[in-house]
């Protein structure tokens, strides 16, 4: 939602968290600002304090309940407002009618672990965190592997077009240090975006056996 020079973007993690970023040109200095969430069909409402993340942008997380509780559904609409203190009052700086399941961004996958490693291949698994049961199997993943001497941006993306929480990396170099990351995205939602990348998992391939071609 954009008001003049203001941009207000929020994502739902599919369970009990709405994360918001508000940016504004000619930023207000020393002003207290909040995000207020008012669902259209729920008894609760929630507030979080916007904290600066850069010169002209602020962020906060609306914690709606216990991490794995299903606080919103596909039919909910939540009015989200940015309110900033002026004098003793609050001023509405930005507003949007937020459809949570149209604006999804899941939590980064967790519990990455090496299941099996060889000289040229490595089998890695992970888990998704705080993802709604509504998705059933309608999720996709992207993975990337950091090779020595390269950057993450240079790493080719591997796409898994189904809910598959493991991958077998092939054609790796023996006795080499790698890092691996994965991210997840539901298939649902017009403005849905990829989760953040997982924490990198470092692993090393096994050295080639001396005198043998493996």
């Amino acid at each position: 939602a954009v008001n003049g020079t203001s941009q207000f973007t929020c994502f739902y993690n599919s369970r009990a968290n709405i994360s918001c970023v508000w940016s504004q040109d000619g930023a207000l200095q020393d002003t207290s600002c909040q995000v207020h969430a008012w669902p259209d069909r729920r008894r609760w409402n929630q507030t979080c304090e916007l904290l600066p993340v850069s010169q002209a942008s602020w962020a906060c997380n609306l914690i709606l309940g216990a991490p794995d509780s299903q606080k919103l559904t596909t039919v909910d609409i939540v009015t989200l407002r940015v309110l900033c203190r002026e004098g003793v009052r609050w001023r509405v700086m930005a507003i949007q009618d937020f459809k949570p399941f149209e604006n999804l961004r899941l939590m980064a996958p967790i519990s990455l672990q090496v299941v099996h490693v060889e000289t040229h291949r490595c089998n890695i698994s992970w888990e998704i965190s705080q993802a709604s049961h509504y998705f059933e199997r309608h999720l996709e993943f992207e993975a990337r592997t950091l090779s020595p001497g390269h950057t993450w941006e240079e790493a080719p993306l591997l796409t898994l077009k189904q809910k598959q929480e493991w991958i077998c990396l092939e054609t790796l170099t023996p006795d080499t240090q790698y890092e691996f990351q994965v991210r997840v995205k539901p298939l649902q939602g017009e403005f849905t975006t990829w989760s953040p990348w997982s924490q990198p998992l470092a692993f090393r391939t096994k050295p080639a056996a001396l005198g043998k071609d493996t």
Partner: antibody, heavy 121, light 112 residues
Framework: QVQLQQSGPELVKPGASVKMSCKAS????????ISWVKQRSGQGLEWIGE????????YYNEMFKGRATLTADKSPNTAYMKLSSLTSEDSALYFC??????????????WGQGTSVTVSS | DVLMTQTPLSLPVSLGDQASISCRSS???????????LEWYLQKPGQSPKLLIY???NRFSGVPDRFSGSGSGTDFTLKISRVEAEDLGLYYC?????????FGGGTKLEIK
């Protein structure tokens, strides 16, 4: 219906103080802001400041800072304004007015009838 | 502080005539949230002010549709399409975009 009932006229001496009241009814006192506005005879309106009774937070127009003190008491639903070190310039009609805690549309929707203050020796 | 200047100071009209009051601000009163908090209040003789118009052109509840507000940036106008006896009094513009909030000096609408 929303009503703001202000205290009666005051005749005070220069250098003295005066405290006027504004009793609210017909709405939840703690959910709205009370603003105070000054009107000198034959002149315009000046915004003095306001108080949010919910947490007693105040804000003053710099022109009135230090001489105006705004307070509120939630049990009789009453807001107060104390003016100190009075001079003839303070002779005026003082209004209280209700305002939404979130300034979404307008500053003040309902006004009291005003308290007349005359500063004279 | 934002200075609000109203013209004319006095506006003599005949009942049934159209009346137009101008209000000019010393600086742009578009708030950083893109709204313009320009309000009009009417103070009838011996009474307290009453809200007529908010956010430039929105009529407050119960205000007759003969009252209309317009303008943008620094120039604003209140129009009364057919003046009635009950419309006589002092009209004030007010800006609520920049603290401290300020009123115009007032325009007296009176019978010609």
């Amino acid at each position: 219906q929303v009503q703001l009932q202000q205290s009666g006229p005051e005749l005070v001496k220069p250098g003295a103080s005066v405290k006027m009241s504004c009793k609210a009814s017909g709405y939840r006192f703690s959910d709205y802001v009370i603003s105070w506005v000054k009107q000198r005879s034959g002149q315009g309106l000046e915004w003095i400041g306001e108080i949010y009774p919910g947490d007693a937070q105040t804000y003053y127009n710099e022109m009135f800072k230090g001489r105006a003190t705004l307070t509120a008491d939630k049990s009789p639903n009453t807001a107060y304004m104390k003016l100190s070190s009075l001079t003839s310039e303070d002779s005026a009609l003082y209004f209280c007015a209700r305002g939404s805690y979130t300034y979404d549309n307008y500053a003040m929707d309902f006004w009291g009838q005003g308290t007349s203050v005359t500063v004279s020796s | 502080d934002v200075l609000m200047t109203q013209t004319p100071l006095s506006l003599p009209v005949s009942l049934g005539d159209q009346a137009s009051i101008s209000c000019r601000s010393s600086q742009n009163i578009v708030h950083s949230n893109a709204n313009t908090y320009l309000e009009w209040y009417l103070q009838k003789p011996g009474q307290s002010p009453k809200l007529l118009i908010y956010k430039v052109s929105n009529r407050f509840s119960g205000v007759p549709d003969r009252f209309s507000g317009s303008g943008s940036g620094t120039d604003f106008t209140l129009k009364i399409s057919r003046v009635e006896a009950e419309d006589l009094g002092l009209y004030y513009c007010f800006q609520g975009s920049h603290i401290p909030w300020t009123f115009g000096g007032g325009t007296k609408l009176e019978i010609k």
